[in-house]
Interface confidence: low
């Protein structure tokens, strides 16, 4: 039987004979920045070209003896996981290795930078097909390393990195914290986050997804036919690099944003046991385990969206937090969340010619998060319509009045410290789906978009008695673009999207003595693109 | 993921151009910043990545590196330019004393300087 990790990333719908075509990833070149490798290992022989790039620090310690097999151990194993003949993910991918880690697995930020520059120069000298760069390494947060990754990503290169093995917030490490990089955490055969001694996989909002990373069988540098089991977020990142190579080989024109959205879309959802993560990180950490798409084609018609959390605003009175989408993505909605419930809502605003999502802390609040819903919507023209506080008992309303524009998200923002519990008596007159409704003391912001064939509808789930969590999901074929709460009263902690489900969280009702007057409604806006569906049918 | 102005230790050295007549003051209203790894054991003091502003050409990077070496030499400091970056980021890698940081931050075109640090196989 195939190793557990390859089994795990293979969707059940694959027929046995269709399991990872032998030439999977053949149009893609994967660069590996790691230790030296044993390129004549039977798993990777003829598949990995060792470049002449080497930039490593001296080994520590006077008694350190350089043993070739130990020097090659980490890189050889990872090359095998990406493209190995027997135990590799993308068996057809060709690889190029750069040595940036010494025999003790240690390197420098500067050496890694020079390696990334080497790749960019190689790309300019001899442009090839899609490039994937695997960075199975981590250091402390580095502005310069993140900046270099951003530049390379904007040059069309897909970068995949290890989240780090420090059982810590991945945002504190680089290149894991670089927004343009696909950051991968590690899970085991039981879908538990991987424990590594006293530490384990990193977590948090800077992780894009998880992948198998414990007891991964791959090429061992001890001999040319040896295999060994290794564990870590490097192994997890290698799986995702392999999956990316497979996807890019099937669809070479995919952009980084499209690839990331597909990786998220085809992942196994909600299978990780979140109890392993610190409580404050659970909501921020994606519950996604990477998998290959069920077939190499046919995803083009989907409207893909993902949720992007901001950094925490911090507790100061006027603190704000900003969540941004990638350059090729559209911000279709914006929400906010505060564990204390003390927040002043959120708004979509233009920054550098692009919409961002900004959340506002309130006096006495411990801080807020902004949550952006970032979607792939070709030829979209989106704008924000705002209505100031109405002060009327009916509450504040705003709608999309431009011809052909549909509502994709609602946000509300208020200046008062506490909205109180005044609830608009009418939440939304039926037959007016393009309308956002909110508290009378709040400004309401509607995200209105025009895109070919885009259609959206509003789904609500209201619970008469106060609940700590209310959810509403979009049905099959529809994608969640907007998630908000009605009413925006002070006991609502916030709203956020998890996959295709809108989650509204409220304060623990047992401690707040809430009444049924404070019942909460979760409001989801679900969209689909008939244009994308038609385009994909025409292709087939 | 992390914003570029995110959670790392930052040391902003205010520029007082009168302290060093040899250094050109940077463009009005901008302050070059110094960054180092928040995890002390991973720091590699003595090697620095000097990152220049985005549109800086290779020739300007080389000129800025030479200027740093010249000004350091006048103060009796040895420096070594280990690498000049171009293609991804404009800038250079320099081996020098931390005592030269304030001088380096005042050089023209400098956006920020980061002390080198370790990375590890995961």
């Amino acid at each position: 039987s195939i190793p557990w990790n390859l089994e795990r990333i293979t969707p059940p719908r694959y027929r046995a004979d269709e399991y990872q075509p032998p030439d999977g990833g053949s149009l893609v070149e994967v660069y590996l920045l790691d230790t030296s490798i044993q390129s004549d290992h039977r798993e990777i022989e003829g598949r990995v070209m060792v470049t002449d790039f080497e930039n490593v620090p001296e080994e520590d310690g006077t008694r350190f003896h350089r043993q070739a097999s130990k020097c090659d151990s980490h890189g050889t194993h990872l090359a095998g996981v990406v493209s190995g003949r027997d135990a590799g993910v993308a068996k057809g991918a060709s690889m190029r290795s750069l040595r940036v880690l010494n025999c003790q697995g240690k390197g420098t930020v500067s050496g890694t930078l020079i390696g990334l520059e080497f790749i960019r120069k190689s790309q300019l000298v001899q442009p090839v097909g899609p490039l994937v760069v695997l960075l199975p390494l981590a250091g402390g947060y580095s502005r310069v390393l993140n900046a270099a990754c951003q530049r390379l990503a904007r040059a069309g290169v897909v970068l995949v990195t290890a989240a780090g093995n420090f059982r810590d917030d991945a945002c504190l490490y680089s290149p894991a914290s670089a927004p343009e990089v696909i950051t991968v955490g590690a899970t085991n055969a039981q879908d538990q986050p991987v424990t590594l001694g006293t530490l384990g996989t990193n977590f948090g909002r800077c992780v894009d997804l998880f992948a198998p990373g414990e007891d991964i069988i791959g090429a061992s540098s001890d001999c040319s036919t040896c295999f060994v089991s290794q564990s870590g977020t490097s192994q997890a990142a290698a799986h995702v690099a392999g999956i990316a190579a497979m996807m890019l080989s099937a669809e070479p024109e995919l952009t980084l944003a499209e690839l990331r959205q597909r990786l998220i879309h085809f992942s196994a959802k909600d299978v990780i046991n979140e109890a392993w993560f610190p409580e404050d990180q659970r909501v921020l950490t994606p519950n996604l385990v990477a998998a290959l798409p069920p077939s190499t084609h046919g995803a083009g018609w989907q409207l893909f969206c993902r949720t992007v959390w901001s950094a925490h605003s911090g507790p100061t009175r006027m603190a704000t937090a900003i969540a941004r989408c990638a350059p090729d993505e559209e911000l279709l909605s914006c929400s906010s969340f505060s564990r204390s419930g003390k927040r002043r809502g959120e708004r979509m605003e233009a920054q550098g010619g692009k919409l961002v999502c900004r959340a506002h802390n309130a006096f006495g609040g411990e801080g807020v998060y902004a949550i952006a819903r970032c979607c792939l919507l070709p030829q979209a023209n989106c704008s924000v319509h705002t209505a100031p506080p109405a002060e009327a008992s009916m509450g504040t309303r705003v709608h999309c009045h431009q011809q052909g524009h549909v509502l994709t998200g609602c946000s509300s923002h208020w200046e008062v410290e506490d909205l109180g519990t005044h609830k608009p008596p009418v939440l939304r007159p039926r037959g007016q789906p393009n309308q956002c409704v909110g508290h009378r003391e709040a400004s309401i912001h509607a995200s209105c978009c025009h895109a070919p064939g885009l259609e959206c509808k509003v789904k609500e789930h209201g619970i008469p008695a106060p609940q700590e969590q209310v959810t509403v999901a979009c049905e099959e074929g529809w994608t969640l673009t907007g998630c908000s709460a009605l009413p925006g009263t002070s006991h609502v902690l916030g709203a956020y999207a998890v996959d295709n489900t809108c989650v509204v969280r409220s304060r623990d009702v047992s401690t707040t003595g809430s009444t049924s007057e404070e019942a909460v409604t979760a409001v989801a806006i679900c969209c689909r693109s008939r244009h994308l569906a038609q385009a994909s049918q025409e292709l087939q | 993921q992390e914003d570029e102005d995110g959670d790392y230790e930052e040391l902003v050295l205010a520029l007082r151009s009168e302290e060093d007549g040899l250094a050109e003051a940077p463009e009005h209203g901008t302050t070059a910043t110094f960054h180092r790894c928040a995890k002390d054991p991973w720091r590699l003091p003595g090697t620095y990545v000097v990152v220049l502003k985005e549109e800086t050409h290779l020739s300007q990077s080389e000129r800025t590196a030479r200027r740093l070496q010249a000004q350091a030499a006048r103060r009796g400091y040895l420096t070594k330019i280990l690498h000049v970056f171009h293609g991804l980021l404009p800038g250079f890698l320099v081996k020098m004393s931390g005592g030269l940081l304030e001088l380096a931050l005042k050089l023209p075109h400098v956006d920020y300087i980061e002390e080198d640090s370790s990375v590890f196989a995961q």
């Epitope: 969707p11 059940p12 414990e214 295999f227 | -």
Partner: antibody
Framework: EVQLVESGGGLVQPGGSLRLSCAAS????????MNWVRQAPGKGLDWVST????????NYADSVKGRFIISRDSSKHTLYLQMNSLRAEDTAVYYC???????????WGRGTLVTVSS | DIVMTQSPDSLAVSLGERATINCKSS????????????LGWYQQKPGQPPNLLIY???TRESGVPDRFSGSGSGTDFTLTISSLQAEDVAVYYC?????????FGQGTKLEIK
Amino acid sequence: EVQLVESGGGLVQPGGSLRLSCAASGFTFNNYAMNWVRQAPGKGLDWVSTISGSGGTTNYADSVKGRFIISRDSSKHTLYLQMNSLRAEDTAVYYCAKDSNWGNFDLWGRGTLVTVSS
Amino acid sequence: DIVMTQSPDSLAVSLGERATINCKSSQSVLYRSNNRNFLGWYQQKPGQPPNLLIYWASTRESGVPDRFSGSGSGTDFTLTISSLQAEDVAVYYCQQYYTTPYTFGQGTKLEIK
């Protein structure tokens, strides 16, 4: 030949300690998680503990947690079970079992008998 | 913990006849990510260690005769011996490996009638 051979069993008093060993051969030891499973006389099978191929992850049955320690030596291709604070109810044949890396056991040793009695 | 319950506790079947052993888990062992049931069947002959017969609830281990078959999904599983042979006299155990602690059924003793 692919096989597992347990040793180290015997008679021990309650509260005493014993160390079981399991020598593996015929397969790449480092690639597979390993387990200890026990069987009290005339009774069914009872999983005791597992250790991952790298040795980085261990799991124990509640009944032995804090008393037993599973470990492995890659260079010797040997699995160990250090049993402390033994009780009468620990009396059983202890089997060493190779894990398929999913949690089912595709190779078993012949077992070693541990008797805890005063 | 997942509790595994086998039925019957013992079974006597004539040579050449069909033998059926059932196993029920206290919670589903079907893993939705790969659509696999994390359930195995073992045979233990007197004085011998157990031997893996079936994994993934229905996949025969190599070398196991094709008269042995496994079926079921979720919480209810069955081991079937289509035509009982003398060498099949043993105790049969089901095991879930969905999560630790891994747990076995109490065993079913199969004899010849």
